[in-house]
């Protein structure tokens, strides 16, 4: 039977009808509506927006729309006791203070409740001491400082530039180095593109602009006080001392004007090489402390933020499936913003809104998807993916049994150059096939497919004629679904042509200047890139929810497993002597990958041939596809990271934003030459190879014929 017959709908209600209903003008209108005031998590304004979205989704035609609330730990500056950093002289007098707020953008001077820049979850404190410049505060930056330059950060306040890695990793690294405070700043080298004006005349970061953000190291835990369980009315909460992932030292972010005042006085060691120099007119000396004339001056932090258990609200909309209502395809993105959220998240939320409207229009005309579609507007993503994680914890039993796929919908744009997709290998073919059917919005590609422009502008490093698709890392709401629950996940957005700056975000990220006007004037005046992203995200959801056979290709997993096994083997082979001494073998892993490849190939053949009119066999084959991602979950989780349970992928231990393959083995091998007990260290490598090999083999067997 055709897809249309299976879902008892008229032929016009196909993917084309859904895509044709999506309108750029609507996305523009929704973005404007969502960005006129701040929608900080835990505030009345964000609760009101949740109720507005609930009401509108009902009007659009969803079967039900509910608010799901949780009481989670959030963090706010003290309104009467602002956070700032000072340079103090030998008498303790403050001779310079960093700014208390960002200069407001034109037209927004009288908006109230703009939260000043702060590092969410910073503890209170007023440390003072000498400054050490630590570049990006990456693991390798601290190696350079401590091992090569013999600079001790213990008892120092460190200043690090934003970019390259998640800010929480920077803070963790600084803590481990013994620092007593962290100053984060945006260097123009990372947040000011040459030849572009600063806001409001362009999309670059002005010197007074500051990136907000949380500095947690949750490792997938969700609410710091209720790890593993929902923060509901009867929750047992940990004491603050036992909370997960909180930083132990004060942290505060500043812009580059203020950073210049701190960095221009730096003395001590010169920067080790040019990669430590940004674009400010300062020497980028590492320190510790200030140079000659200023050597008696110190830096003092004044941090008075408070952590508060606060109510948050997710909006959950349901469009019931006609044939398999117990199979869930989820489209989710967050609603809370640091300030106006012009890009993050409302460029994504506006797209979700239009996708819901289009699905609702089809439903009002008598159509239903084959499977149930759940739509989610998550709260408190900016405070550690809290809304999505609490909801998934509350519904984990349903999700692990019924979850087909999760499509994430945060910012639709971070540039306007080409498409960017991160997803499970199971979705590669879905994404390829879909983008071949969509028109490219790019200049110079009129009449060409999105696949063609994407492949041209962002080619795969391995496969000629194909586009790059990246691994899923974290730092967004797919984390709990993919890394903890093993639900096939993907994300798509339009991005910049800036591969070297992959994890630094766009210049105005998390600043007060992320406004509607930023998008409408500089990024996407015609909203054509937003529309394309809506078509990709919506098209993926449509196919996942409506195709008779799930659009997953397990053979693509086989290909990447071999690639990842080769990669981790080559890392290990940098230590050939130790491999020999401790009898380290990857044979079991390569054998498991080989078995997976053969079984996946046979499964794909059966998938072509089986009788799709037999609902029991159809359901059986689809369940094997749905549960394949689940089969990569290790119930025990990764070492010291129990909520990262996917054996093939995890967020990098050194950068939450980046995905790492075979993370258990990778972490066991990392810096192994410096371990005090090599025998124990190599024993852990062997254990991780065993876990990986077993998991790949076990996953392969889920694809075998059932009897």
């Amino acid at each position: 039977k055709s897809s249309n017959e299976a879902t008892n709908i008229t032929p016009k209600h196909n993917m084309k009808a859904f895509l044709d209903e999506l309108k750029a003008e609507n996305i523009k209108k929704f973005l404007y509506n969502f960005t006129q005031i701040p929608h900080l998590a835990g505030t009345e304004q964000n609760f009101q927006l949740a109720k507005q979205i609930q009401s509108q989704w009902k009007e659009f035609g969803l079967d039900s729309v509910e608010l799901a609330h949780y009481d989670v730990l959030l963090s706010y500056p003290n309104k009467t006791h602002p956070n700032y950093i000072s340079i103090i002289n030998e008498d303790g007098n403050e001779i310079f203070n960093t700014s208390l707020f960002e200069p407001p953008p034109p037209g927004y001077e009288n908006v109230s409740d703009i939260v000043p820049p702060f590092s969410a979850f910073s503890p209170q404190g007023m440390p003072e001491g000498d400054l050490v410049y630590v570049n990006y505060a990456r693991t390798e930056d601290f190696f350079k400082l401590e091992r090569d330059m013999k600079i001790n950060c213990s008892g120092k306040i460190v200043i690090a530039r934003y970019g390259k890695v998640f800010r929480g990793n920077k803070v963790k690294n600084a803590q481990l180095a013994g620092a007593k405070g962290v100053i984060l700043y945006s260097d123009p080298a990372d947040y000011f593109a040459p030849g572009v004006k600063s806001y409001p005349d362009g999309w670059n970061l002005p010197g007074g602009g500051v990136q907000r953000g949380n500095i947690l190291n949750l490792n997938g835990a969700g609410d710091p006080l209720t790890p593993g369980y929902p923060a509901n009315e009867y929750a047992y909460r940990r004491g603050i001392a036992e909370a997960v992932g909180l930083p132990s030292i004060p942290v505060h972010p500043i812009g580059y004007y203020d950073a210049q005042k701190l960095l221009e006085k730096m003395g001590g060691s010169a920067p080790p090489d040019s990669s430590w120099r940004g674009s400010l007119k300062v020497p980028y000396n590492v320190g510790p402390g200030f140079t000659g004339n200023f050597s008696t001056q110190k830096v003092k932090m004044h941090i008075h933020s408070t952590n508060e258990v606060t109510r948050i609200y997710n909006v959950i909309g349901t469009l019931r499936g006609a044939v398999e209502p117990d199979r869930y395809v989820i489209l989710g993105g967050h609603r809370d913003s640091w300030v106006f959220g012009g890009i993050d998240p409302q460029s994504g939320a506006a797209v979700v809104h239009e996708i819901v409207r289009s699905f609702g229009t089809l439903k009002k005309e008598g159509w239903r998807p084959r499977r149930t579609i759940l739509f989610a507007s998550w709260d408190a993503e900016e405070f550690g993916l809290l809304g999505s994680t609490e909801w998934a914890e509350e519904n984990s039993r349903l999700l692990q049994e019924r979850g087909v796929a999760y499509i994430n919908a945060d910012s639709s744009i971070e540039g306007n150059y080409t498409l960017r997709v991160d997803c499970t290998p199971l979705m590669y073919s879905l994404v390829h096939n879909l983008t071949k059917e969509l028109k490219s919005p790019d200049e110079g590609f009129e009449g060409k497919s999105l696949y063609e422009s994407w492949t041209k502008k962002s080619p795969s490093p391995e496969f000629s004629g194909m586009p790059r698709i990246s691994k899923l890392g974290s730092g967004n709401d797919f984390e709990v679904f993919f890394q903890r629950l093993g639900i096939a996940s993907g994300r798509a957005r339009y991005t910049k042509n800036w591969e070297t700056n992959k994890f630094s975000g766009y210049p105005l990220y998390h600043s007060v200047y992320e406004t509607y006007e930023l998008v409408e004037k500089f990024y996407d005046p015609m909203f054509k890139y937003h529309l394309t992203v809506a078509q990709v995200r919506g098209g993926m959801v449509f196919e996942l929810a409506n195709s008779i056979v799930l659009p997953f290709d397990c053979r693509d997993y086989a290909v990447v497993l071999r690639k990842y096994a080769d990669k981790i083997y080559s890392i290990s082979m940098k230590h050939p002597q130790e491999m020999k001494t401790y009898s380290v073998s990857f044979d079991s892993l390569f054998s498991a990958v080989k078995n997976f490849t053969e079984i996946a190939s046979k499964f794909s053949e059966r998938l072509q041939d089986f009788d799709k009119s037999n609902p029991i066999v159809l359901r059986m084959m689809n369940d094997q596809l749905m549960f394949l991602e689940r089969a990569f979950i290790d119930p025990l989780g990764l070492p010291d990271r129990p909520f990262y349970r996917h054996v093939i992928y995890a967020p990098s231990s050194h950068n939450k934003y980046a995905g790492e393959s075979f993370p258990g083995i990778y972490d066991a091998l990392f810096d192994i030459e410096s371990k005090v007990d090599p025998s124990k260290a190599w024993g852990e490598v062997k254990r991780q190879i065993y876990v990986a090999a077993f998991t790949v083999q076990a996953a392969a067997e889920t694809l075998s014929e059932v009897a």
């Epitope: 310079f96 203070n97 960093t98 700014s99 001077e109 007119k281």
Partner: antibody, heavy 122, light 108 residues
Framework: QVQLQESGGDVVQPGRSLRLSCAAS????????LHWVRQAPGRGLEWVTL????????YYADSVKGRFTISRDNSKNTLYLQMNSLRAEDTAVYYC???????????????WGQGTTVTVSS | SYELTQPPSVSVAPGQTARITCGGN??????VHWYQQKPGQAPVLVVY???DRPSGIPERFSGTNSGNTATLTISRAEAGDEADYYC???????????FGGGTKLTVL
């Protein structure tokens, strides 16, 4: 259009006080650092004081430190200069000026008022 | 404290190029701004950040800065360019704005 308008200049006796005001219009006042610069008759420009856009930093020339106080009211789009213990050498035209960007230190002053005259004489 | 030294006067024939210097210790490491002031008027910013021009300022005005000298160059000088010119920097050692003594430009 972008404008600064000083007022409050007067003839005062040495040792007395005076408060100058500078009313701003045509730009986002709370987003810019501001300066007072003076010019004695027949002399060059002399910087007097600055204030950051949020009021968190104030710096003064040595010649006025302890006697003059700069302040701003962002809700009224107005900059002030409170001048105490005035001396004959404070006689000058006083200009207020805004910086090209929010930072009041390293950047130029792109908008100036027409000035207000302060004469200190017995 | 930091000092900026300018020649008291510079003369130039109409249509020729005038160069006004501003000397200061390692001034090349600082951002230099230049102002034009005509008699009885407020100063006007003509060059900022060493070499950038505000909108409305003719391309004839340009600036350079390196070593111990910053220079304001006015090409194809006109009678209307007659004015006092001041250079200015921020001195981070003293946390003071510093102006040069000014240069009177005469277009002969």
């Amino acid at each position: 259009q972008v404008q600064l308008q000083e007022s409050g200049g007067d003839v005062v006796q040495p040792g007395r006080s005076l408060r100058l005001s500078c009313a701003a219009s045509g730009f986002s006042f709370s987003g810019y650092g501001l300066h007072w610069v003076r010019q004695a008759p027949g002399r060059g420009l002399e910087w007097v004081t600055l204030i950051s856009y949020d009021g968190s930093n104030k710096y003064y020339a040595d010649s006025v430190k302890g006697r003059f106080t700069i302040s701003r009211d962002n809700s009224k789009n107005t900059l002030y200069l409170q001048m105490n213990s005035l001396r004959a050498e404070d006689t000058a035209v006083y200009y207020c000026a805004k910086t090209t960007v929010s930072d009041p230190y390293y950047y130029g002053m792109d908008v100036w008022g027409q000035g207000t005259t302060v004469t200190v004489s017995s | 404290s930091y000092e900026l030294t300018q020649p008291p006067s510079v003369s130039v024939a109409p249509g020729q190029t005038a160069r006004i210097t501003c000397g200061g210790n390692n001034i090349g490491s600082k951002s230099v701004h230049w102002y034009q002031q005509k008699p009885g008027q407020a100063p006007v910013l003509v060059v900022y950040d060493d070499s950038d021009r505000p909108s409305g300022i003719p391309e004839r005005f340009s600036g350079t800065n390196s070593g111990n000298t910053a220079t304001l160059t006015i090409s194809r000088a006109e009678a209307g360019d007659e004015a006092d010119y001041y250079c200015q920097v921020w001195d981070s050692s003293s946390d003071h704005v510093v102006f040069g003594g000014g240069t009177k430009l005469t277009v002969l």
